[in-house]
């Protein structure tokens, strides 16, 4: 059974993941972002099911494409400081949260998604899991 300190750590990590994903989404949705139309042409794989921490495997597998799209999109009005560091930070959190005991084969949905839909899906995942922690 999870201890209160391990639950607290999980909560913190999920909150940090939530903030980082929302920061990216806010940057993309910024009305001054001239690359938004182009960014929306890139397709991301969505998880068929994302209800447990181990399903973060599906997010981990899409972090490289996410980094590539964000790098392509950098401009004066859309600037995420140190995209590499940001994705690396997200990766560290994801690895800790999902654990390494069991390697899950990620099951993806048939339909791909835009970067906005992709980020919203994982933001909702974080919100949902945080809300169940006691």
């Amino acid at each position: 059974a999870p201890t209160s300190s391990s639950t607290k750590k999980t909560q913190l990590q999920l909150e940090h993941l939530l903030l980082d994903l929302q920061m990216i989404l806010n940057g993309i949705n910024n009305y001054k972002n001239p690359k938004l139309t182009r960014m929306l042409t890139f397709k991301f794989y969505m998880p068929k099911k994302a209800t447990e921490l181990r399903h973060l495997q599906c997010l981990e597998e899409e972090l490289k494409p996410l980094e590539e799209v964000l790098n392509l999109a950098q401009s004066k009005s859309f600037h995420l400081r140190d995209t590499k560091d940001l994705i690396s930070n997200i990766n560290v959190i994801v690895l800790e949260l999902k654990g390494s005991e069991t390697t899950l084969m990620c099951e993806y949905a048939d339909e791909t998604a835009t970067i906005v839909e992709f980020l919203n899906r994982w933001i909702t995942f974080c919100q949902s899991i945080i809300s169940t922690l006691t």
């Epitope: 913190l12 909150e15 903030l19 980082d20 806010n26 400081r81 560091d85 930070n89 919100q127 809300s131």
Partner: antibody, heavy 115, light 107 residues
Amino acid sequence: QVQLVQSGAEVKKPGASVKVSCKASGYTFTGYYMHWVRQAPGQGLEWMGWINPNSGGTNYAQKFQGRVTMTRDTSISTAYMELSRLRSDDTAVYYCARDLTFDYWGQGTLVTVSS
Amino acid sequence: AIQLTQSPSSLSASVGDRVTITCQASQDIFNLLNWYRQKPGKAPDLLVYRASNLETGVPSRFSGSGSGTDFTFTISSLQPEDVGTYYCQQSANLPLTFGGGTKVEIK
């Protein structure tokens, strides 16, 4: 015990900048994001943004974008919030608060902007 | 941004009274809502996190409930030291937002 201790009150002229510090103790500084919240006299609370003390990554509320800069010095467990091009309506108490649930707050720093 | 509508904006009650404050979010925020009390001239203090979890050291007369868009904060028996302004705050979406506050006074 966890403590967030902020720098003292400041009086600034319109157009100037102010830098408020928040020294953390009693916990691992790099393990928790630090948020900044302000409160104008007699008003409610307004979130300004956050910094990840580990990476230095920041995210600012749209309202303050371009005017606010959040930094940190991990060697002294201190977060900083600098607000530039000050106006009279920036007169407020500025608070640092720890992580998403704001479980610990600094005592507040009154910044008065007046000509 | 998510709007939080807090009511009432102020109330006056007697010692021992049950006091209820509500907070309505403009969209679903799960249970990602916190409650704070701010005494005059002081920083806010966290009382309840994630809608219904009492922060360590907070008296059991304080409680919170709700999820989705409707939330309630209750003081079961008002004490003189409970005066101050109470704020709800959502931690579901950026920008983080606060309710307008409820000023609680003793009759």
